[in-house]
Interface confidence: low
């Protein structure tokens, strides 16, 4: 008599998570008499997936009526597939007995589950950095299968190349995670810049998933300081201005010192934004020249975003101020920093 064949026609089946998977199995002969059982995996640790005679398998249904006379189709359908269902499924014929004896196994069908990656989450550096420094952004996405995936980084539409990407685990798994780090060199113009992490995968039947981060969260643009003296007023008062320009973020405190003593402290708030996202601020100090016998040393001291203070000093020459109106005079810099170094 012809030897019984257990035929599993598909070597592999790929199914999207949430869908149903059909695992086909037919036998070439009705004899010998005995049941068919489905297992996941081979060997002693295999897992029983479906047994027509006994057991409760709520997600597994036979494709054709197994009680039908002369039935030779023992295909099954597994509903609501999850990544945990991945594996190789074997259709196994048993000879009826006490107990039943395994007679022949099909070649197996590998079920792979296509699961979508989670939306990429991009995180930036914990502390701000200044222009010309390199900061790192990380992007993570989880729960996808199969393992093949690509991740690209962009800054303002341009692909970044200083990138390191890892997909875990390295071996076989029901689902995978990707983590990528991109290194970005900051420029003073990056307040409005954005980095984008783009993930593409077989399950994404359309545009890739994207996660974004704004460089405004990562950058500090230190201010430029300039102190100038306006014209001498008729009432013997000199108007000195401190111009603080091109800084970001807005968090800034300005202190005027007269001969080393605090004269006034101001906090920046509700400033208009420059086109490039930075801010400017101008503070004025009126100095009554007639109240001083000696020259007055004025210092504009700026603390920006919790950084060490930057000073710009200016001397008002009392002897040089008769009552007539003077002209604008640029500051002489006697401070520690003429400008911040970037």
């Amino acid at each position: 008599e012809e030897e019984l064949q257990v035929i599993q026609p598909e070597k592999s089946v790929s199914v999207a998570a949430g869908d149903s998977a059909t695992l086909n199995c037919t036998v070439s002969s009705l004899i010998p008499v005995g049941p068919i059982q489905w297992f996941r995996g081979a060997g002693p640790g295999r897992e029983l997936i479906y047994n027509l005679k006994e057991g409760h398998f709520p997600r597994v249904t036979p494709v054709s009526d197994p009680t039908k006379r002369n039935n030779m189709d023992f295909s099954i359908r597994i509903s609501n597939i999850t990544p945990a269902d991945a594996g190789t499924y074997y259709c196994v014929k048993f000879r009826k007995g006490s107990p039943d004896v395994e007679l022949k196994s099909g070649a197996g069908t590998e079920l792979s589950v296509r699961a979508k990656p989670s939306a990429p989450v991009v995180s930036g550096p914990a502390v701000r950095a200044t222009a010309e420094h390199t900061v790192s952004f990380t992007c993570e996405s989880h729960g996808f299968s199969p393992r093949d995936i690509t991740l690209k980084w962009f800054k303002n539409g341009n692909e970044l190349s200083d990138v390191q990407t890892n997909v875990d685990p390295a071996g076989k798994s029901v689902s995978y995670s990707i983590r990528s780090t991109a290194r970005v060199v900051l420029t003073r113009r990056d307040v409005h810049s954005q980095v984008i992490c783009e993930v593409a995968h077989v399950t994404l039947q359309g545009d890739p998933l994207r996660g974004t981060a704004n460089l405004s969260e990562a950058i500090r643009v230190p201010p430029f300081l300039e102190v100038t003296q306006q014209s001498m007023r008729a009432d013997n008062q000199v108007n000195v201005t401190c111009q603080v320009t091109k800084f970001y973020p807005q968090r800034l405190q300005l202190t005027w010192l007269e001969n080393g003593n605090v004269s006034r402290t101001e906090m920046a708030s509700a400033l208009p934004e420059n086109k490039d996202g930075t801010y400017n601020w101008t503070s004025w100090l009126l100095v009554n020249v007639s109240a001083h016998r000696d020259d007055v040393k004025l210092t504009c001291q700026v603390e920006h975003d919790g950084q060490p203070a930057v000073n710009k000093s200016f001397s008002v020459k009392v002897s040089a101020h008769p009552k007539e109106q003077g002209s604008n005079t640029a500051a002489e810099n006697t401070g520690t920093n003429e400008r911040n170094i970037y």
Epitope: D148, I149, T150, G157, A200, H201, V202, T203, L204, Q205, G206, D207, P208
Partner: antibody, heavy 123, light 107 residues
Framework: QIQLVQSGSELKKPGASVKVSCKAS????????MNWVRQAPGQGLEWMGF????????TYAQGFKGRFVFSLDTSVSTAYLQISSLKAEDTAVYYC????????????????WGQGTLVTVSS | DIQMTQSPSRLGASVGDRVTITCRAS??????LAWYQQKPGKAPKSLIY???YRYIGVPSRFSGSGSGTDFTLTISSLQPEDFATYFC????????TFDQGTKLEIK
Amino acid sequence: QIQLVQSGSELKKPGASVKVSCKASGYSITNYAMNWVRQAPGQGLEWMGFINTYTGEPTYAQGFKGRFVFSLDTSVSTAYLQISSLKAEDTAVYYCARTRGYYDFDGGAFDYWGQGTLVTVSS
Amino acid sequence: DIQMTQSPSRLGASVGDRVTITCRASQNVGTHLAWYQQKPGKAPKSLIYSAIYRYIGVPSRFSGSGSGTDFTLTISSLQPEDFATYFCQQYNTYPLTFDQGTKLEIK
């Protein structure tokens, strides 16, 4: 580097059939959908549809159902466009174009194009 | 089908000019918009996808903007090799549709 190389120009009589090939190199053809785009003389671009190179399943735009067939032979990394019962109005340049995203099997933006195949239908 | 309308259909310009081509979709396509350049007798060349992203190798003088229904392709300083026809394409909804193109000519 990545290239899509199409077969040469064809001159056919009305009622005949033509098969245009598009050979992909520099990447795995099964990772990117392949689109077909028609450009009639002096006209704009018209999307005909695409083939999902992972499953082999074609999707046809409305005006291209019936006489147009997209197929694939992954063993030679080649996509095909077959047009049967040719008409004079089928005279055009036919382009294959790769969908941009890796594992992006839908039609979408196209990153690489074949050089085009001119099909002329004339009695 | 989503109709794509580009303006102008022909545009005269000189080397060094800043050129703007606009493209309008008959309904919202999000950012699923691409731009292509085509020279006579040649295949189209891909410039921009997802409205703003340049393909690698595309000069930075090309930039895209817009979302929803109104999109712009800008060439900041026109070079001799930029004289060509430019097409926009939406890929938000089937069928994918192109506009009729803007022919950029030497003034």
